[in-house]
């Protein structure tokens, strides 16, 4: 048969941030194409990315149906131009992915500080509630909608004139912190899911400093 040149996919890897989820694999195809299937542990296989020469497949639409489920994918290899051909066992070569549970494993995307406002010796810092591709009732849910109180934010804040970073935490998207009067402060936030054992923290948000246009100062 024409399968002698067909090689199985390998290094199947899930790449997922805020539930945008792509399966990647190797090798770059030479005279072959791939089809991906995905299923939950108890569900039926669903085919995606039919006969593609890509080495990645966006599976977001499937995993967002239930982000707490555990998914398995497999990548089938077919000879180019002869996709009906099968392997010696009577079916095309395929390789299984590792299991993937989006709720536990999707990386937390870099957060953004939406605004900060100083009132006297207090500063209110607000974190943008990022939209995900998870839907409920035809509406896209925010990160907070999906994770609820499992998601916290850590705020790093420091005087512009010093390097030591103080921290504060919140399970909402707002911080209210005490600052010294007449001092300018800088801020950065990190998303954290403490209940996880891996992928617990996002990268830090871009640093925002007082005296820049995102903030507002009110003397009271």
């Amino acid at each position: 048969s024409g399968t002698t040149n067909t090689v199985a996919a390998y290094n199947l890897t899930w790449k997922s941030t805020n539930f945008k989820t792509i399966l990647e694999w190797e090798p770059k195809p030479v005279n072959q194409v791939y089809t991906v299937q995905i299923s939950t542990k108890s569900g039926d296989w669903k085919s995606k990315c039919f006969y593609t020469t890509d080495t990645e497949c966006d599976l977001t639409d499937e995993i967002v149906k239930d982000v707490k489920q555990t998914y398995l994918a497999r990548v089938f290899s077919y000879p180019a131009g002869n996709v009906e051909s099968t392997g010696s066992a009577g079916e095309p070569l395929y390789e299984n992915s590792p299991e993937f549970t989006p709720y536990l494993e999707t990386n937390l995307g870099q957060p953004t500080i939406q605004s900060f406002e100083q009132v006297g010796t207090k500063v209110n810092v607000t974190v943008e509630d990022e939209r995900t591709l998870v839907r409920r009732n035809n509406t896209f849910l925010s990160l907070r909608d999906v994770f609820g109180k499992d998601l916290i934010y850590t705020l790093y804040y420091w005087k512009s004139s010093s390097s030591g970073k103080k921290t504060a935490k919140t399970n909402t998207n707002e911080f209210l912190i005490d600052v010294d009067k007449g001092e300018n402060y800088c801020f950065s936030v990190q998303a954290v899911i403490p209940s996880r054992t891996v992928n617990r923290k996002s990268t830090d948000s871009p640093v925002e400093c007082m005296g820049q246009e995102k903030g507002e100062f009110r003397e009271i």
């Epitope: 916290i152 850590t154 790093y156 390097s163 030591g164 970073k165 103080k166 921290t167 504060a168 935490k169 919140t170 399970n171 005490d178 990190q190 954290v192 403490p194 209940s195 996880r196 054992t197 891996v198 992928n199 617990r200 923290k201 990268t203 830090d204």
Partner: antibody
Framework: EVQLVESGGGLVQPGGSLRLSCAAS????????IHWVRQAPGKGLEWVGY????????YYADSVKGRFTISADTSKNTAYLQMNSLRAEDTAVYYC?????????????WGQGTLVTVSS | DIQMTQSPSSLSASVGDRVTITCRAS??????VAWYQQKPGKAPKLLIY???FLYSGVPSRFSGSRSGTDFTLTISSLQPEDFATYYC?????????FGQGTKVEIK
């Protein structure tokens, strides 16, 4: 199993330097925060400083600011406490501890400690 | 910095006694208070987190409570292995701060 093991303590003269290590196993330090806490003989617990190993950001107690530096090597899963300009009052058992990082739980695992004696 | 004032600094009690240790924060720390037990030559061990929650593996005779900025650790019936030093700690703001400790000794 989560474990923290400190090493590098010993006898040092006033004005001298010492580097303590905190080797972590059972978890990845960049997913957490690492604190150093010390305890002078017969005294209570005193917080020294922390590091977020993911970004290298730190904060120190006033008593050690400018003399002590906390760093981390994520490839070795190890945090360090570099102590310079040591004084007699820095004599203590030094502990590293993992910060769980939630609103509710802070220092959930501690190392066994390493003794630093500053004396001429 | 927030001060945590712990009392008493030491107490003598007998096995079976009910023991209460208190900590007062110099300002609001919400429920971000932990209690640790330390035995001589050993590292502190977490007993209570978030003011009133028992940490995994800690016997149920230990309990914690909060009233405003006052925090209490109670041992309902003191056991021989409970003779140790106890510390409160706030982690509401940086720097985190500890109470001075309470040594529980055998009467």
């Amino acid at each position: 199993e989560v474990q923290l093991v400190e090493s590098g303590g010993g006898l040092v003269q006033p004005g001298g330097s010492l580097r303590l290590s905190c080797a972590a196993s059972g978890f990845t330090i960049s997913d957490y925060w690492i604190h150093w806490v010390r305890q002078a003989p017969g005294k209570g617990l005193e917080w020294v400083g922390y590091i977020d190993p993911q970004n290298g950001w730190t904060y120190y107690a006033d008593s050690v600011k400018g003399r002590f530096t906390i760093s981390a090597d994520t490839s070795k899963n190890t945090a360090y406490l570099q102590m310079n300009s040591l004084r007699a009052e820095d004599t203590a058992v030094y502990y590293c501890a993992r910060d769980y990082g939630s609103l509710e739980v802070s220092l959930d695992y501690w190392g066994q400690g390493t003794l630093v004696t500053v004396s001429s | 910095d927030i001060q945590m004032t712990q009392s008493p600094s030491s107490l003598s009690a007998s096995v079976g006694d009910r023991v209460t240790i208190t900590c007062r924060a110099s300002q609001d720390v919400n429920t971000a208070v932990a209690w640790y037990q330390q035995k001589p030559g050993k590292a502190p061990k977490l007993l209570i987190y978030s003011a009133s929650f028992l940490y995994s593996g800690v016997p149920s005779r230990f309990s914690g409570s909060r009233s405003g900025t006052d925090f209490t650790l109670t041992i309902s019936s003191l056991q021989p292995e409970d003779f140790a030093t106890y510390y409160c700690q706030q982690h509401y703001t940086t720097p985190p701060t500890f109470g001075q400790g309470t040594k529980v000794e055998i009467k």
